[in-house]
């Protein structure tokens, strides 16, 4: 990996764990939403998500544990909150998000999300 090779996977995993820890703390501390129907705040293994409004796209900054974060810090990862108040899932039922803007190789162009 061109730029990111200087950062070890071990180091990235440690940063990811710290990101997760901070996220889980914020999930418990943030006030609850005003409405009854909403997508629950969550850590989906990639990013930390606030409560979502049904039928909307939610975006958060690319996670800071990425080795190339300095290149993508002003970009966003997107997640869709379905009309039923459930986060949209991937084809195998896995948590889904469009992280194409956060990929190391991206130079501003958008690509299709994971199949």
């Amino acid at each position: 990996r061109p730029q990111g090779a200087t950062v070890s996977l071990w180091e990235t995993v440690q940063k990811w764990r710290e990101y997760r820890r901070q996220c889980q703390r914020s999930l418990t501390e943030d006030p609850p939403p005003a409405t009854d129907l909403f997508c629950n705040r969550t850590f989906d293994e990639y990013a930390c998500w606030p409560d979502g409004e049904p039928g909307s796209f939610v975006n958060v900054s690319c996670p800071w544990y990425l080795p190339w974060h300095h290149k993508v810090q002003h970009r966003f990862v997107f997640k869709r909150c379905g009309p039923d108040g459930q986060w949209v899932r991937g084809p195998r039922g896995q948590p889904w998000r469009d992280a194409s803007e956060c990929e190391e190789s991206k130079r501003g162009e958008r690509s299709s999300p994971e199949e």
Partner: antibody, heavy 128, light 107 residues
Framework: QVQLVESGGGVVQPGRSLRLSCAAS????????MHWVRQAPGKGLEWVAV????????DYVDSVKGRFTISRDNSKNTLYLQMNRLRAEDTAVYYC?????????????????????WGQGTTVTVSS | DIQMTQSPSSLSASVGDRVTITCRAS??????LGWYQQKPGKAPKRLIY???SLQSGVPSRFSGSGSGTEFTLTISSVQPEDFVTYYC?????????FGGGTKVEIK
């Protein structure tokens, strides 16, 4: 060695319930997705349900939704299938099978590796 | 749901013949496909994973190829123990779906 052993099958009347179990050994059960697959007499294979890790990700084939419930007890290395409101068309050999996945923290992608180890099966017959 | 169309449903061959079985997916599934062998009264056994990788312990006469929507299982020289039923399985999307099966019979 890696082993999956199903139990709990039998003959049951339509509308009644049955619970199947799948005892796993020889691998880290909590690190695998676990599936149920069935095969009606003389027919092909049909996927029934899957459950990953702690149960946050479960899914079912349409024909059993609302009637069957997949669950697991990682402390007992055991997978379950609770089958309610059984129908004649549920008659089949039921197999459990495992699946490994891999999550890449750099891309956010989940990679799935398919069903690699299967149990020997347990027979469920729904008949009046 | 993704439909897996497997052909032929049955075929006859002689020991030593080359046998080819095909599975077609109703939409692209990358290489998320396995091939399984099932002997009467037994559980399926995986032969090929990721469309073309040979499962450990499986004889090298079995091979798989394809990606996207078209997949093939080939037995280069059929042996007596190979005259059983074969299934493909896609694990790209829920619900997972199997092909209808191919019964390989002795000519």
């Amino acid at each position: 060695q890696v082993q999956l052993v199903e139990s709990g099958g039998g003959v049951v009347q339509p509308g009644r319930s049955l619970r199947l179990s799948c005892a796993a050994s020889g691998f880290t059960f909590s690190s695998y997705g676990m599936h149920w697959v069935r095969q009606a007499p003389g027919k092909g294979l049909e996927w029934v349900a899957v459950m990953w890790y702690d149960g946050s990700n479960k899914d079912y084939v349409d024909s059993v939704k609302g009637r069957f419930t997949i669950s697991r007890d990682n402390s007992k290395n055991t997978l379950y299938l609770q089958m309610n409101r059984l129908r004649a068309e549920d008659t089949a050999v039921y197999y459990c099978a495992r699946e490994k996945d891999h999550y890449d923290i750099l891309t956010g992608y989940n990679y799935y590796y398919g069903l690699d180890v299967w149990g020997q099966g347990t027979t469920v017959t729904v008949s009046s | 749901d993704i439909q897996m169309t497997q052909s032929p449903s049955s075929l006859s061959a002689s020991v030593g013949d080359r046998v080819t079985i095909t599975c077609r997916a109703s939409q692209g599934i990358r290489n998320d496909l396995g091939w399984y062998q099932q002997k009467p009264g037994k559980a399926p056994k995986r032969l090929i994973y990721a469309a073309s990788s040979l499962q450990s312990g499986v004889p090298s006469r079995f091979s798989g190829s394809g990606s996207g929507t078209e997949f093939t299982l080939t037995i280069s020289s059929v042996q007596p123990e190979d005259f059983v039923t074969y299934y493909c399985l896609q694990h790209n999307s829920n619900p997972l779906t199997f092909g209808g099966g191919t019964k390989v019979e002795i000519k």
